[in-house]
């Protein structure tokens, strides 16, 4: 069960894992997205471009991810279930100017041991 804003799709659950989606504006061409649990960086993905629109992805923490033109989704297979944690995304925009860094809205996630029922409270 997920409580909170019904149209917020930051978290989704499947196969015992959690997909956490971090949205960004479609106009952004080059960016770095970080996923935090509290103060810990869990995942980091950088998308850069070259001439001829060649795209390069840097994924130094080897997270499972899916990249679209307006979001980065990270897949956590064994999320910490010992206690509720606050997850949020941090976005750095390199292109187009100006350079920006911002924390995106996050959510508080509690996963019961069974991982069959999840409670989510959103902090926007």
């Amino acid at each position: 069960e997920i409580n909170g804003s019904a149209d917020h799709r930051m978290f989704s659950f499947h196969n015992g894992g959690v997909q956490i989606s971090c949205k960004y504006p479609e106009t952004v061409q080059q960016l770095k997205m970080r996923l935090f649990r509290e103060r810990e960086v869990l995942c980091e993905l950088t998308k850069t471009k070259g001439s001829g629109n060649a795209v390069s992805i840097k994924n130094p923490m080897l997270c499972l991810y899916h990249l679209s033109n307006n979001s980065v989704s990270f897949f956590l297979n064994n999320p910490d279930s010992s206690q509720g944690s606050y997850y949020f995304c941090s976005l750095s925009i390199f292109d187009p100017p100006p350079f920006q860094e911002r924390n995106l809205s996050g959510g508080y996630l509690h996963i019961y041991e069974s991982q069959l029922c999840c409670q989510l409270k959103l902090w926007l």
């Epitope: 061409q29 080059q30 770095k32 950088t46 850069t48 471009k49 070259g50 001439s51 060649a54 390069s56 840097k58 750095s92 390199f94 292109d95 187009p96 100017p97 100006p98 350079f99």
Partner: antibody, heavy 124, light 107 residues
């Protein structure tokens, strides 16, 4: 302290080759896109070539395309420029420069740290 | 390719005066991919402004950039002795290109 130190310049005859190196210290080298920029003494600046964080994406000024090759070795914190079929008009001071954002891209980014340059003289 | 023209070629001013440097592009510089650099004799260029108007880290607030499209301006509010140098504008969208420079010297 960030340092970029170029080497490998010298005097070479037209049609000859040189390999320039740029040794980086004080930074996480693979976080940065890198470029070579040259300057004829007493004249303006000309961007020569750029490379992204892992060497996947490269680009060249029309004036050097097909003659120069940019590469990098992240394990050695080094950037290179292989210069073949050199011409008198390639005579210049060659600078390496990193991308300002730490984006890993050379594309659509300004340059902040520059080395002090290495002089290439092409003369018969 | 986008060609940049800088004016004036040389600007002779006294310390404390205001300097206004112009950079004009042959076609619109998309998303304000425009930077300004300062270069002193025997030194490498130093990034001052990027994105047409954002000051780079550590750059004093007497330096400001403005403009969009094809017309850009670098303003130095009150010239300090260390500001006398050559200033280059650069468009860094796609293949980077630099202007020919404006020399700011002491009157």
């Amino acid at each position: 302290e960030v340092q970029l130190v170029e080497s490998g310049g010298g005097v070479v005859r037209p049609g000859g080759s040189l390999r320039l190196s740029c040794a980086a210290s004080g930074l996480t080298f693979d976080d940065y896109g890198m470029s070579w920029v040259r300057q004829v003494p007493g004249k303006g600046l000309e961007w020569v070539s750029g490379i992204n964080w892992n060497g996947d994406n490269t680009d060249y000024a029309d004036s050097v395309k097909g003659r120069f090759t940019i590469s990098r070795d992240n394990a050695k914190n080094s950037l290179y420029l292989q210069m073949n079929s050199l011409r008198a008009e390639d005579t210049a001071l060659y600078y390496c420069a990193r991308d300002y954002y730490g984006s890993g891209s050379y594309y659509n980014v300004p340059f902040d740290y520059w080395g002090q340059g290495t002089l290439v003289t092409v003369s018969s | 390719e986008i060609v940049l023209t800088q004016s004036p070629g040389t600007l002779s001013l006294s310390p404390g005066e205001r300097a206004t440097l112009s950079c004009r592009a042959s076609q619109s510089v998309s998303s304000s991919y425009l930077a300004w650099y300062q270069q002193k004799p025997g030194q490498a260029p130093r990034l001052l402004i990027y994105g047409a108007s954002s000051r780079a880290t550590g750059i004093p607030d007497r330096f400001s950039g403005s403009g969009s499209g094809t017309d850009f301006t670098l303003t130095i509010r009150r010239l300090e002795p260390e500001d006398f140098a050559v200033y280059y504008c650069q468009q860094y969208g796609s293949s980077p290109f630099f202007g020919p420079g404006t020399k700011v010297d002491i009157k």
